[in-house]
Amino acid sequence: QNCSGPCRCPAEQAPRCPAGVSLVLDGCGCCRVCAKQLGELCTERDPCDPHKGLFCDFGSPANRKIGVCTAKDGAPCIFGGTVYRSGESFQSSCKYQCTCLDGAVGCMPLCSMDVRLPSPDCPFPRRVKLPGKCCEEWVCDEPKDQTVVGPALAAYRLEDTFGPDPTMIRANCLVQTTEWSACSKTCGMGISTRVTNDNASCRLEKQSRLCMVRPCEADLEENIKKGKKCIRTPKISKPIKFELSGCTSVKTYRAKFCGVCTDGRCCTPHRTTTLPVEFKCPDGEVMKKNMMFIKTCACHYNCPGDNDIFESLYYRKMYGDMA
């Protein structure tokens, strides 16, 4: 890093510097290097860009090893191809008011960076760019089939049936993902769905995954120990392959399933995770599908008729999905 040793330059000729970065001789007068820019670390060998009025500020005379490229007092700024004098203010766009100060540009947002939390009046808030407006504004996504306007119907809205549990705020979008619905089948391969706006356009979309609460062929009741009424998570002795429309999972899985009760209770998944499963079909085609994997089950008396989709969604949602 210092100039005491002999000159050693990279084998290739002069380096190619990014646009606007000067090609200069290093501080030892040995090799041509790309000049360090404002705020970057500099050394004796890695000099700052002299064409921009920058110098290597080592902070204290004792420290002469590594400094920071700093602009001389009153140095101008180059921003978006325009030169601004020190102390000059300018609007870089309708969204930002900027000021040049000693070679450094600082900008303040002109648009509100406010956050909007969900409420009965606006369950799925997101920021959008409206035509003719500079700043993005909050809009509230209404579910497609909501015909009556007003929070008094909050309990019956689609997104509330699925139960939005917003947890994350991304740039201009309150990311919300609902809990997974109950599996559409009590045994065998079924479908579980959820609603999310966790996508590039912040639009509500429906996601689905395969699910199997328990195999249909398993006779689980005979495994219930004497004196017990339930077997919550029966042990599956051997790894299994999943089947889907004539296609078979490429890998074998030692999956957990939910058990049964003899006292009228039903056992459903409580904690789940979602993983991709590859299926190979007889024609050689391989397809990848997301599938629910059970971590824990719970036994309870909320056992609505399986054909009542809304009731089953309400009572038997998947909680605590890890994916």
């Epitope: 406010d114 969900p118 009965p120 606006c122 007003g150 008094a152 309990a155 509330d160 139960g163 549990d165």
Partner: antibody
Framework: EVTLKESGPVLVKPTETLTLTCTVS????????VHWIRQPPGKGLEWLGV???????DYNAAFMSRLTISKDTSKSQVVFTMTNMDPVDTATYYC????????WGQGTTVTVSS | ESVVTQPPSVSGAPGQRVTISCRSS?????????ANWVQQLPGTAFKGLIG???NRAPGVPDRFSGSKSGTSASLAITGLQAEDEADYYC?????????FGGGTKLTVLG
């Protein structure tokens, strides 16, 4: 910066009507609703009502017959009216922004006394 | 009996984790209740902490978190600090109206 400020009389007589105004800045009343909440001396909070972003209202059933909330979006003002005031209505009255009650006014203390 | 109940007081030492519960006597707390938590510091106005069950309001440190389970919503505060000493209120939405809990006084010991 988001701010809400309540204004109105500090003293009203029993049977009179209380009118409070909540003036907001930093957000639009067409984007956010505004709630009214009160806190009697030494007690907890009581939700009174709300005017939603689209102008609809919901009220606490206990005050339904006495309460009216309206707004003038262009003036960024919400007006709260409570009729037939009683000494038990003595409290600090607050307006708060919808969406997690994230921003509140500083409150205005109203005493009902003859 | 109140529809929404909170413990009157909770306490904890600096650095500890405390939770404040908000119980609905009507049934399970769901996302349709849009559980909210607000803080009232001594002698000052109110400040929203959590909205929509688990979303922090602007400027609220991530030491504060909201959740729900069964018939309760909860506010958890980790790494307790002296300035957290305040009254905390929850509010639950019931289709046409909000109901506030009675409030919980948090005391930071020591």
């Amino acid at each position: 910066e988001v701010t809400l400020k309540e204004s109105g009389p500090v003293l009203v007589k029993p049977t009179e009507t209380l009118t409070l105004t909540c003036t907001v800045s930093g957000f639009s009343l067409s984007t956010f609703g505004v709630h009214w909440i009160r806190q009697p001396p030494g007690k907890g909070l009581e939700w009174l009502g709300v005017i939603w972003r689209r102008g609809g209202t919901d009220y606490n059933a206990a005050f339904m017959s006495r309460l009216t909330i309206s707004k003038d979006t262009s003036k960024s003002q919400v007006v709260f009216t409570m009729t037939n005031m009683d000494p038990v209505d003595t409290a600090t009255y607050y307006c708060a922004r919808d969406g997690g009650f994230d921003y509140w006014g500083q409150g205005t203390t109203v005493t009902v006394s003859s | 009996e109140s529809v929404v109940t909170q413990p009157p007081s909770v306490s904890g030492a600096p650095g500890q984790r405390v939770t404040i519960s908000c119980r609905s006597s009507i049934g399970a707390v769901t996302t349709s209740n849009y559980a909210n938590w607000v803080q009232q510091l001594p002698g000052t106005a109110f400040k929203g902490l959590i909205g929509g069950t688990s979303n922090r309001a602007p400027g609220v440190p991530d030491r504060f978190s909201g959740s729900k389970s069964g018939t309760s919503a909860s506010l958890a505060i980790t790494g307790l600090q002296a300035e957290d000493e305040a009254d905390y209120y929850c509010a639950l939405w019931y289709s046409t109206h909000y109901v506030f809990g009675g409030g919980t006084k948090l005391t930071v010991l020591g």
